[in-house]
Amino acid sequence: APMGSDPPTACCFSYTARKLPHNFVVDYYETSSLCSQPAVVFQTKRGKQVCADPSESWVQEYVYDLELN
């Protein structure tokens, strides 16, 4: 994020390199445009937050499925 700006609660330094099991993912949010890079944050059943690359096809697929549900 630009110095001096206040990003929202979470940004991502980088992205996971593995595809999460579909049934592990229960929710998601997109990080703010104030963050230095775009990211999708998946919430897992265990309450973990996982940073993912929004340009990856599996990430787009999971987001689509979560929106449907």
């Epitope: 110095m3 206040d6 979470a10 991502c12 390199a17 996982v50």
Partner: antibody, heavy 120, light 110 residues
């Protein structure tokens, strides 16, 4: 449980290179970054760099020309290589786990460190 | 490269509240610096306490809290315990790299 363990040569001659391995367990390198940090005797911490799950790296700009960080996900190992060592590179060298999200502690679990002495 | 400054040493007593601070020479510390606090205990035992300015790591006692106070990051220990005697390092993120402060040696008399 989460564990990180550094292994290194102990003694390095001036102008030679340093190679340290960080072996991790209890988590996957595909889901976390690994930071390298050093502490000269009696001094504070200096961040050296980080390797992210996809293999991308960030480095301390003052040391970038001498540093290389790489990894082998299948062996759960991360490697630090530093060239052209001088006596002021004498330090304890640590690896630390790096979560990807900014709302978590960015170096949450640390290894016990490996001592490196640069001397002829 | 940025320089991050901490008090070199502080002394407190059990039960007292003590605040350690972390200043950047580039200007005010903001939430974009994702201030972290790391504790060093004897025998090179490091533990991450606080991340993202004010988020406690799992298992870290509630007496440890992080915040921004004025133009600095701060670590407050509310009701210090003798086991809190340690060296505390802050670390600030500058777009693509971390910089550590010099550390604060906290003595808890008692």
């Amino acid at each position: 449980q989460v564990q990180l363990k550094e292994s290194g040569p102990g003694l390095v001659a001036p102008s030679q290179s340093l190679s340290i391995t960080c072996t991790v367990s209890g988590f996957s390198l595909t889901g976390y970054g690994i930071h390298w940090v050093r502490q000269p005797p009696g001094k504070g911490l200096e961040w050296l760099g980080v390797i992210w799950p996809g293999g991308g790296t960030n480095y301390n700009s003052a040391l970038m020309s001498r540093l290389n960080i790489s990894k082998d996900n299948s062996k759960s190992q991360v490697f630090l290589k530093m060239n052209s060592l001088q006596t002021d590179d004498t330090a304890m060298y640590y690896c630390a786990r790096g979560p990807l999200i900014t709302t978590e502690v960015s170096m949450d679990y640390w290894g016990q460190g490996t001592s490196v002495t640069v001397s002829s | 490269q940025a320089v991050v400054t901490q008090e070199s040493a502080l002394t407190t007593s059990p039960g007292e509240t003590v605040t350690l601070t972390c200043r950047s020479n580039t200007g005010a510390v903001t939430t974009s610096n994702y201030a972290n606090w790391v504790q060093e205990k004897p025998d090179h035992l490091f533990t991450g306490l606080i991340g993202g300015t004010n988020n406690r790591a799992p298992g870290v006692p509630a007496r440890f809290s992080g915040s921004l106070i004025g133009d600095k990051a701060a670590l407050t220990i509310t009701g210090a315990q003798t086991e809190d005697e340690a060296i505390y390092f802050c670390a600030l993120w500058y777009s693509n790299h971390w910089v550590f402060g010099g550390g604060t040696k906290l003595t808890v008399l008692g």
